[in-house]
Interface confidence: medium
């Protein structure tokens, strides 16, 4: 009764299609698979960025897999062939591992790469990234930004740079069609006549870096003798009402400061007839139903009631 063996996949490699971190892991079938023609051979793939403690594990029948990686670090992967127990009349058979690595040969010392990279997706409409030049780089150093997300045929270079002293220090992106809820990859590389410049790679999802506009049309309405309803409208733009959280700051008679976070465009405030002055401001942020993270908007313009009976007047800014 001969022991059943299976070979590992052939030509296992990590292929960089030029998408700034979105890599293909590819392999060829093992030799001598024809013995198992009636059987679905599977592959167990493990991969990670070098330095990560955990492996991602995938079991697939395909000969390729795609995922995003941090190209600032190396990548390691390993794969083996699996013969399910149905193929072997017994227990699952595994081949030995085939292993591969991939990294981009770094140019320049780490200090030459851009510093303090910051990207904000203003009002879910306009992406702007800014950075500071690397430490100790000369004025002849210029940085170039490239970006890619699934849907683009190839990585694109920024066409509208923000400049300071002749150096690129940021990028205003064009309209980015169908670019949210997927990984957005950026590489900022550089060139200098004096020394090589280290490239930097960044990955994020646009919906997680949205900074909305502040809410507008703040109003007061007296609901009862002891309640005032504060209302406002969602900011103009593409973000639907269901995607907002709000933070309100309310000041009564220059003494009491109320801070509250709410999900709707209203807030009911308990007050007294003695209230002589009421002011509030609101800011907005994309909520957990639409993103994993976000940036608070600027505060709205202040809306105040002063010296008049709130029961007689609704104030509209």
């Amino acid at each position: 009764d001969t022991e059943i063996k299976v070979n590992p996949p052939q030509d296992f490699e990590i292929v960089d299609p030029g998408y700034l971190g979105y890599l293909y892991l590819q392999w060829q079938p093992p030799l001598s698979l024809d013995h198992f023609k009636e059987c679905t051979v599977e592959y167990e793939l493990k991969y990670r960025n070098i330095g990560s403690e955990t492996w991602k594990t995938i079991i697939t029948k395909n000969l390729h897999y795609k995922d995003g990686f941090d190209l600032n670090k190396g990548i390691e992967a390993k794969i083996h062939t699996l013969l399910p127990w149905q193929c072997t009349n017994g227990s699952e058979v595994q081949s030995s591992w085939a292993e591969t690595t991939y990294w981009i040969s770094p140019q320049g010392i780490p200090e030459t790469k851009v510093q303090d990279m910051d990207c904000v997706y203003y009002n879910w409409q306009y992406l702007l990234c800014s950075w500071k030049p690397g430490i100790g780089v000369l004025l002849d150093t210029n940085y170039n930004l490239f970006y890619w997300y699934e849907g683009l045929d190839h990585a694109l270079q920024c066409v509208d740079y923000i400049k300071a002293d002749g150096q690129n220090i940021g990028c205003r992106f064009p309209y980015l069609e169908a670019s949210d809820y997927k990984d957005f990859y950026i590489c900022v590389n550089g060139s200098s006549e004096n020394k090589p410049i280290r490239s930097s790679y960044f990955t994020f999802q646009l919906q997680n870096i949205v900074k909305p506009l502040p809410p507008v049309y703040l109003t007061f309405t007296r609901e009862s003798s002891c309640e005032i309803k504060l209302k406002w409208s969602i900011p103009l733009g593409p973000i639907p009402a269901r995607c907002f959280d709000y933070e309100i700051e309310i000041r009564e008679d220059d003494t009491t400061l109320v801070t509250a976070t709410v999900e709707n465009e209203t807030y009911t405030l308990k007050t007294t007839n003695e209230t002589r002055q009421l002011c509030f401001v609101v800011r907005s942020k994309v909520n957990i139903y639409c993103s994993d993270d976000g940036i608070w908007s600027e505060w709205s313009d202040k809306q105040c009631w002063e010296g008049e009976d709130l029961s007689k007047k609704t104030l509209l800014r």
Epitope: E13, Q28, P29, D34
Partner: antibody
């Protein structure tokens, strides 16, 4: 339409060099291994070299090892064959061929270019 | 290296004939054999891979069989456009060698 177009062939003297190119279109080039296969006038097919999809794995026929170099540029959808120290017996039509791949099989050639003629003669 | 020995080297047949071409590998290659058709002045065209799997668009009159060392390409009813040279190739392990070819001519 899936297409492979070879170029770079011509007449070269023995000991000379030539670089063949193959432009691929109509498929995701970086997903397939690629090969060069040649055919001497009036003779059969001879496999020359293969490069894997990412370029990490390269295989040569003994008859060209050390003289020919296969390479690819996935960004340009191009395959190359650098031929040095050419001999009269290298005279052939050189075909660029895509490596077909199925779940159980690989290394057969499912798409071929039209070929480019290399003549090595003094 | 694995050698592929093809026979016959040529044959004459008429339209409608059943034609069989054989290929023998010098060692066991499982089912890793492909068959190609080539017409004068043209590039080869894949017919069969993995011994018996027809490539996309190949007519059903072409079939392949065999495993181990002995393989067969059969054309069940020869058509005028089938007059050409046929090659086998093993796709088991490098180097990937071809048979010497079989020229199918009009009788």
């Amino acid at each position: 339409e899936v297409q492979l177009v070879e170029s770079g062939g011509g007449l070269v003297q023995p000991g000379g060099s030539l670089r063949l190119s193959c432009a691929a279109s109509g498929f995701t080039f970086s997903r397939n291994g690629m090969s060069w296969v040649r055919q001497a006038p009036g003779k059969g097919l001879e496999w020359v070299a293969t490069v894997s999809s990412g370029g990490s794995y390269i295989y040569y026929a003994d008859s060209v090892k050390g003289r020919f170099t296969i390479s690819r540029d996935n960004a340009k959808n191009s395959l190359y064959l650098q031929m040095n120290s050419l001999r009269a017996e290298d005279t052939a039509v050189y075909y660029c061929a895509r490596q077909g791949t199925t779940a159980l099989a690989t290394r057969f050639f499912d798409v071929w270019g039209q070929g480019t003629l290399v003549t090595v003669s003094s | 290296d694995i050698q592929m020995t093809q026979s016959p080297s040529s044959l004459s047949a008429s339209v409608g004939d059943r034609v069989t071409i054989t290929c023998k590998a010098s060692q066991d290659v499982g089912t890793a054999v492909a068959w190609y058709q080539q017409k004068p002045g043209k590039a080869p065209k894949l017919l069969i891979y993995s011994a018996s799997y027809r490539s996309t668009g190949v007519p059903s009159r072409f079939s392949g069989s065999g495993s181990g060392t002995d393989f067969t390409l059969t054309i069940s009813s020869l058509q005028p456009e089938d007059f050409a040279t046929y090659y086998c190739q093993h796709h088991y392990s490098a180097p990937w060698t071809f048979g010497g070819g079989t020229k199918v001519e009009i009788k």
